[in-house]
């Protein structure tokens, strides 16, 4: 028996359902009573879901997995993972045994988009050209860790005096805080871009400092 899985990682958004595709080619006369199907975590070999002796043995993994029972006889051994969490990320092995056996691994990459950044300024009044200001760009609830880029109004990257911290919450999602320290010119726009490297999603925030009231 030959097992086939997608070579590309499966990308799943947090709290959505994901399908880990796995298939085999059943011989003529194949019956489910002959099938021994095991989904397991590749690294630890922890059982995730199994089908043996003609019966779905159920989820051994947070009760959030399911097979496609009506499609098994056609060789579809895919696994449905419900309400994906950050901790589900990793490699899963589909192990199929009929008379002989084969297995293949598929990777699950979990992702969550970052929120539109909020911008804060310190100090935020009585600003004069030549003053040192601290601009903070904050974006929330994303995964995996973000890439943060700062630019001035002309699109020139600002790399000096940038400090970025990323903290994971109890769900494993990251809150990003990036701080730019800059000496004010006469007028200036400072923009922050928070990029999710898996989703290729960019979230933008900017602040414009003029002689007039600040605009965000």
């Amino acid at each position: 028996v030959e097992v086939q899985v997608s070579e590309d990682p499966v990308v799943a958004l947090v709290d959505t359902d994901a399908t880990l595709r796995c298939s085999f080619s059943p011989e003529p006369g194949f019956s489910l009573a002959q099938l021994n199907l095991i989904w397991q975590l590749t690294d630890t070999k922890q059982l995730v879901h199994s089908f043996t002796e003609g019966r779905d043995q159920g989820s051994a993994y947070s009760n959030r997995t399911a097979l496609f029972p009506d499609l098994l006889v056609q060789g579809n051994a895919s696994l449905r993972l419900q309400r994906v969490r950050v901790t589900d990320e990793g490699s899963y092995t589909c192990f199929v045994s009929i008379q002989d056996f084969d297995s293949a691994a598929v990777s699950l990459q979990v992702a969550a988009p970052y929120s539109k950044p909020s911008m804060t300024l310190e100090p935020n009044k009585d600003l004069r050209p030549g003053n040192m200001v601290t601009i903070t760009c904050s974006s929330y609830q994303g995964y995996p860790e973000a890439e943060v880029f700062w630019k001035d109004g002309q699109g020139v990257p600002l790399t000096g005096n940038v400090t970025t911290s990323q903290m994971a919450n109890e769900r494993g999602l990251f809150d990003v805080h990036s701080v730019l320290r800059v000496v004010l010119g006469a007028n200036g726009t400072y923009s922050c871009l928070v990029r999710n490297p898996v989703l290729q999603q960019d979230a933008h925030g900017s602040v414009t400092i003029t002689g007039q009231p600040l605009t965000f």
Partner: antibody
Framework: QVQLQQPGAELVKPGASVKLSCKAS????????MHWVKQRPGQGLEWIGM????????NYNEKFKSKATLTVDKSSSTAYMQLSSLTSEDSAVYYC?????????WGQGTTLTVSS | QIVLTQSPAIMSASPGEKVTMTCSAS?????MHWYQQKPGTSPKRWIY???KLASGVPARFSGSGSGTSYSLTISSMEAEDAATYYC?????????FGAGTKLELK
């Protein structure tokens, strides 16, 4: 005929580890899940976990996850369970059992005594 | 986890008497399995998939039930039936056993 052979007894000191064995014969070892079950003197049965010899897949009762480690040696058709950081609470009879629909064949059990 | 509650914990029956013991599950399950154990021996498969008798089990035994309520019945007690009977579920992990019903000969 199907047989699961286990040593009759093991005596170990508190804090030590022990590796219990279960040698299978009379069937294709790699085709069936092997389970381990604990029974304290005069008590009921407690499921520890299971291992599939072919894939190496394991599934543990959360209660025993830090206590038991299940492995197999396919070449000798033997299943093993290592128990660590032993205390008197671990003194019990430990059975291996083959799964087919239910736990259809059981070993005779190994009596583990943890005592100094 | 699914908790299996067996009752009674201990019972006695005279030869020829009908015996029924029950097993209640804390959540609905697909099948119940039963094992017989005599002192100093390992458990033996007895009834599987709720009502199917394992090989070598006398026809006087039967099993029934669905959902959360299951039972094992002996139509006519015999001396060799004295043992402890455990119910067992494998519909949900971790697999669990009942605490057992000890059946004694009166």
């Amino acid at each position: 005929q199907v047989q699961l052979q286990q040593p009759g007894a093991e005596l170990v000191k508190p804090g030590a580890s022990v590796k219990l064995s279960c040698k299978a014969s009379g069937y294709t070892f790699t085709s069936y899940w092997m389970h381990w079950v604990k029974q304290r003197p005069g008590q009921g049965l407690e499921w520890i976990g299971m291992i599939h010899p072919n894939s190496g897949s394991t599934n543990y009762n959360e209660k025993f996850k830090s206590k038991a480690t299940l492995t197999v040696d396919k070449s000798s058709s033997t299943a093993y369970m290592q128990l660590s950081s032993l205390t008197s609470e671990d003194s019990a009879v430990y059975y291996c059992a083959r799964e087919s629909r239910q736990l259809d064949y059981w070993g005779q059990g190994t009596t583990l005594t943890v005592s100094s | 986890q699914i908790v299996l509650t067996q009752s009674p914990a201990i019972m006695s029956a005279s030869p020829g008497e009908k015996v029924t013991m029950t097993c209640s599950a804390s959540s609905s399950i697909s099948y119940m399995h039963w094992y017989q154990q005599k002192p100093g021996t390992s458990p033996k498969r007895w009834i599987y998939d709720t009502s199917k008798l394992a090989s070598g089990v006398p026809a006087r035994f039967s099993g029934s039930g669905s959902g959360t309520s299951y039972s094992l019945t002996i139509s006519s007690m015999e001396a060799e039936d004295a043992a402890t009977y455990y119910c067992h579920q494998r519909s949900s992990y971790p697999l669990t056993f009942g605490a057992g019903t000890k059946l004694e000969l009166k």
